[in-house]
């Protein structure tokens, strides 16, 4: 049939909860292409009816929820004007009781469910939530050994759990929980994460480089909306936290009530030698109190700020 076959690594998935897989294979999917999902080499495509438990949502296949019988090989066919690629994804559904303390780790879990914290450092865990835009995700709750995590060493930031001054006691079984809403129905997503610790620097002691900002000022009119990207390059193996702070406080915490200034979701692009990270800060409405205040982008030990300033008066207008 002229399609190139591409085999993805196996995915281990938890039963009875939502799961989605995006059929992306850059640069194939960056142009004008059609994407169709199939199960177990069936000639009949996966349904696109949003009420179906399993359906295609744009380039995604969405299970609401995943069930035992859903294990198998799924294919997505990407057809371009002059090309065809068939991507094979092997999905294995398992039953995992996250509070079963007799199970010491899960060796077959996908890598994103095994994470490492660095002793004595400020580090973070990530709740990997890959779902299409049609899925609305609520706030994330974090658990360790089935108890909700509390304490001043822990901060929830977007999809991350920040852990300050990591200790040996921080190793063990974690879970992040979120309520997903799709077409008015609610589903629970509970991702178990086995967390191990290391003393190793992990990234060879290299320092992340902040490409932008450069301790610079930005001219911005009062009352306007402003979005500023912080661009960072870092080694692929880094465990650095990336965030925006003001007055040495996370912006999301500092503006917790008004939510007028917020940190965006971190994205990254992977290059051969390094990752390029972007995390933005959004000012919904610039106020007088924002001028002259350093808004700091932090990445590990690196930091750089932007400072807002009023534009110089334009005398030509008079």
């Amino acid at each position: 049939d002229g399609c190139n076959d591409i085999f993805m690594k196996n995915e281990m998935l938890s039963a009875s909860q939502p799961f989605a897989f995006n059929c992306t294979f850059p640069p194939i999917t960056s142009g004008e292409v059609s994407v169709t999902w199939y199960k177990n080499s069936s000639k009949i495509p996966v349904s696109k009816i949003i009420q179906s438990r399993i359906h295609q949502d744009e380039t995604w296949i969405l299970f609401l929820p995943m069930e035992w019988g859903d294990s198998g090989v799924y294919q997505c066919v990407i057809k371009g004007r002059d090309s065809c690629h068939r991507i094979h994804v092997n999905l294995t559904v398992f039953e995992k009781q996250w509070c079963d303390t007799s199970v010491k780790g899960l060796p077959n879990l996908s890598d994103e469910y095994k994470q490492i914290l660095h002793l004595g450092k400020d580090d973070s865990l990530t709740c990997h939530l890959h779902f299409p835009k049609s899925c609305i995700l609520g706030p994330i709750k974090w658990y360790k050994d089935c108890n909700e995590i509390t304490g001043e060493r822990f901060t929830v930031l977007e999809t991350r759990l920040l852990v300050s001054n990591v200790s040996a006691e921080d190793r063990g079984n974690y879970a992040c929980q979120v309520i997903l809403t799709h077409s008015g129905k609610q589903y629970e997503v509970l991702n178990g994460i086995t967390v191990s610790i290391t003393e190793r620097a992990g990234y060879g002691g290299s320092v992340p480089k902040i490409i932008y900002p450069k301790n610079n000022s930005i001219e911005v009119q009062l009352g306007t909306t402003l979005i500023v990207d912080c661009n960072i390059t870092d080694t692929k193996d880094n465990t650095n936290l990336r965030c925006w702070r003001v007055n040495n406080t996370l912006v999301d915490d500092y503006y917790n009530e008004s939510k007028r200034i917020r940190e965006g979701v971190e994205t990254h692009a992977s290059f051969r030698e390094y990752n390029l990270y972007t995390v933005n800060i959004t000012f919904l409405e610039v106020k007088m109190e924002d001028y002259g205040l350093p808004f700091m982008c932090h990445a590990g030990v690196s930091a750089a700020y932007i400072m807002l300033q009023l534009p110089a008066p334009d005398f030509r207008a008079y």
Partner: antibody, heavy 120, light 106 residues
Framework: QVQLQESGPGLVKPSQTLSLTCTVS??????GYWNWIRNHPGKGLEYI?????????YYNPSLKSRVTISRDTSKNQYYLKLSSVTAADTAVYYC??????????????WGQGTLVTVSS | DIQMTQSPSSLSASVGDRVTITCRAS?????MYWYQQKPGKAPKLWIY???NLASGVPSRFSGSGSGTSYTLTISSLQPEDFATYYC?????????FGQGTKLEIK
């Protein structure tokens, strides 16, 4: 159960390159840290280096100019190359990994070791 | 580099003896790891995170210490304990082992 197995030639000529393979079963080398350690005859253990889950490599500075650790995730194998060997590189070479009780540095799983002799 | 100095280098002792092996680091380390090695065999993880016994290690073994001084203690030596013991640190690269302590039957 995690198992590691070293393989490679037992005899290498001086000035040549020593090449060893560690084949891993029961775990994926895309998680954790994968180490090489050697034991000189009648002497102690020497840490050579590691390759991490992401492919990052660390080498002991005393060997850095001569050592390369690499991997093939499709085969679940990782490798040691040591160039310009001399008789001082004669040792039993071990591959090992941690993760015991969620501690990556607790090297719980070891290969059986392979003796490499450098001699003409 | 952090130098790890074990003492004694070798030790003759009798079954039932209490034995202490010391590992001194040239700079502070956060945790110590101990390995047991018998002739012709791979090392075995014995003690991790300074004081935790690995699976299968008898309770007569214990580990303690902090900063630059760490000890492995055997409360009552048994025939199967005769081996070489190594300490190791992962706090600062290069990750170094002690030179080993050979425990022999008197």
């Amino acid at each position: 159960q995690v198992q590691l197995q070293e393989s490679g030639p037992g005899l290498v000529k001086p000035s040549q390159t020593l090449s060893l393979t560690c084949t891993v079963s029961g775990a994926s080398i895309t998680s954790g840290y994968w180490n090489w350690i050697r034991n000189h005859p009648g002497k102690g253990l020497e840490y050579i280096g590691y390759i991490s889950y992401s492919g990052y490599t660390y080498y002991n500075p005393s060997l850095k100019s001569r050592v390369t650790i690499s991997r093939d995730t499709s085969k679940n194998q990782y490798y040691l190359k040591l160039s310009s060997v001399t008789a001082a590189d004669t040792a039993v070479y071990y591959c090992a990994t941690g993760g015991y009780d969620y501690v990556e540095d607790a090297l719980y799983y070891w290969g059986q070791g392979t003796l490499v002799t450098v001699s003409s | 580099d952090i130098q790890m100095t074990q003492s004694p280098s070798s030790l003759s002792a009798s079954v039932g003896d209490r034995v202490t092996i010391t590992c001194r680091a040239s700079s502070n380390v956060r945790y110590m790891y101990w390995y047991q090695q018998k002739p012709g065999k791979a090392p075995k993880l014995w003690i991790y995170l300074t004081s935790n016994l690995a699976s299968g290690v008898p309770s007569r073994f214990s580990g303690s210490g902090s900063g630059t001084s760490y000890t492995l203690t055997i409360s009552s030596l048994q025939p199967e304990d005769f081996a070489t013991y190594y300490c190791q640190q992962f706090t600062t690269s290069p990750y170094t082992f002690g030179q080993g302590t050979k425990l022999e039957i008197k």
